[in-house]
């Protein structure tokens, strides 16, 4: 979390910013907060990105200014502009990039004063895990897949009844780079699975972290995964 | 050049399935936002379905759970998966290439009519 | 959900007038995703304008945009023979994802 203040105290207000993952080829969000005004025409939000010569987005009086906007952010970004009379400053990006990662500053005037605070922004690629028991195989085999990471992740086994296990000499992951030749799919098997047990395959890089669970037992079969960002820190 | 060229309409009966597919020239179709949208006889534009650069799809409600948007990477193709289909169905289909700057690119069209 | 608009339904007009066509949204539509469509008959539809202003690549300048909220506007300053067709406005980002106005009409007179 990235708390910023106006320059002289009578004339500051608060900016909150939250540093934030974007998912390329997705719409993002980048995070931003401030003390709200009563009148909407005295709200004025810039965004800005450190080493872009124009503004990323700038909303005044009420809509949206895009006279000086930068070619690179063109025809891709909005605020909330039914929220900002309550605060809201966040901007949404659409068709996340690599190249729009980077330090943004979200700048505010109100009535009441000025302030800013700084967001970095990572991108990357993150996708959820599916886990499945691979029948083609000799013995009993678990394959995890996951069809878009960057950059590239590690793969960790964990199993609930061999907690501590390191299951890298019995497993095997691969990462096969995509059509657009940024992400990669990413395969791990795991070998000489037991039965009646839960393992988990988890897939992690610097911008999320994914986990994918399965239990195989004499009757079923039962899935779960789940994904979490990482690094969302407020400002 | 870049280019959008649809293929796989015809005349279908109501409740059957058609696959429509869209070849991309010119451009990687996932690193764009890719749409299908379609035109009744007479009537206006109709956005139908969306795959994301992800592969994340979103669909209109009046095609939800019916039609499935799908790419093939491989092939720089775009597929509509039609289940289901209605009279009111009946239209002209387009793929269009969302990119930065709005549907900037649009193929031919392919006519699709849902009729006994 | 949002409800793009557009009026009037038909525009009766001379080649060498001014033209102007309006596009109303049922709620706040950001500028950057309000785009302009230009169809003639039994052809796709072409992007005209993006970014509620900007003129796509290869269109004239005679072809401009302008508004923020929910009133835009597109304006032919001098009407060409092939300028009559239908134009649609669309937004992208509200539920549904995209909206594309009933169009207008822009006939000779």
């Known amino acids: 979390l990235i708390i910023g203040f106006g320059i002289s105290g009578r004339h500051s207000i608060t900016v909150t910013t939250v540093a934030s993952a974007g998912n390329i080829g997705e719409d993002g969000i980048l995070s931003c907060t401030f003390e709200p005004d009563i009148k909407l025409s005295d709200i004025v939000i810039q965004w800005l990105k450190e080493g872009v010569l124009g503004l990323v987005h700038e909303f005044k009086e009420g809509k949206d200014e895009l006279s000086e906007q930068d070619e690179m952010f063109r025809g891709r970004t909005a605020v909330f502009a039914d929220q900002v009379i309550v605060g809201n400053a966040s901007l949404r990006l659409k068709n996340v990039q690599l190249t729009d990662a980077g330090t943004y500053k979200c700048y505010i005037i109100t009535s009441k004063g000025k302030g800013n605070a700084n967001l970095e922004y990572k991108t990357g690629a993150f996708s959820m895990p599916e886990v499945n028991v691979d029948y083609n195989a000799s013995s009993e085999t678990l394959r995890c897949e996951a069809p878009r990471w960057f950059p590239q992740p590690t793969v960790v086994w964990a199993s609930q009844v061999d907690q501590g296990a390191n299951f890298s000499e019995v497993s095997n992951t691969s990462f096969e780079l995509n059509s657009e030749n940024v992400t990669m799919k990413v395969v791990s098997v795991l070998y000489n699975v037991t039965i009646n047990n839960t393992y988990s395959c988890m897939i992690e890089n610097d911008i999320a972290k994914a986990t994918g669970d399965i239990k195989v037992t004499e009757s079923e079969i039962k899935r779960r995964s789940h994904l979490q960002l990482l690094n969302s820190k407020a400002s | 050049e870049v280019q959008l060229v649809e293929s796989g309409g015809g005349l279908i009966q109501p409740g059957g399935s058609l696959r429509l597919s869209c070849a991309a020239s010119?451009?990687?179709?996932?690193?764009?936002?890719m749409n299908w949208v379609r035109q009744a006889p007479g009537k206006g534009l109709e956005w139908v379905s969306v795959?994301?650069?992800?592969?994340?799809?979103d669909a209109a409600d009046s095609v939800k759970g019916r039609f499935t948007i799908s790419r093939d990477n491989s092939k720089n193709t775009l597929y509509l998966q039609m289940n289901s289909l209605r009279a009111e169905d009946t239209a002209v289909y387009y793929c269009?290439?969302?990119?930065?700057?709005?549907?900037?690119?649009w193929g031919q069209g392919t006519t699709v009519t849902v009729s006994s | 959900e949002i409800v793009l608009t557009q009026s009037p339904g038909t525009l009766s007009l001379s080649p060498g007038e001014r033209a102007t066509l309006s596009c109303r949204a049922s709620?706040?539509?950001?500028?950057?995703?309000l785009a302009w469509y230009q169809q003639k008959p039994g052809q796709a539809p072409r992007l005209l304008i993006y970014?509620?202003?900007s003129r796509a690549t290869g269109i004239p300048d005679r072809f401009s945009g302008s508004g923020s909220g929910t009133d835009f506007t597109l304006t032919i300053s001098r009407l060409e023979p092939e300028d009559f067709a239908v134009y649609y406005c669309?937004?992208?980002?509200?539920?549904?994802?995209?909206?594309f106005g009933q169009g207008t009409k822009l006939e000779i007179k």
């Open positions: 269009a290439r969302d990119g930065d700057y709005g549907m900037d690119v």
């Open positions: 010119g451009f990687i179709v996932s690193r764009n936002y």
């Open positions: 795959i994301y650069g992800s592969g994340r799809t």
């Open positions: 709620q706040s539509v950001s500028s950057s995703y």
């Open positions: 970014g509620a202003s």
């Open positions: 669309q937004q992208y980002g509200s539920s549904p994802l995209y909206t």
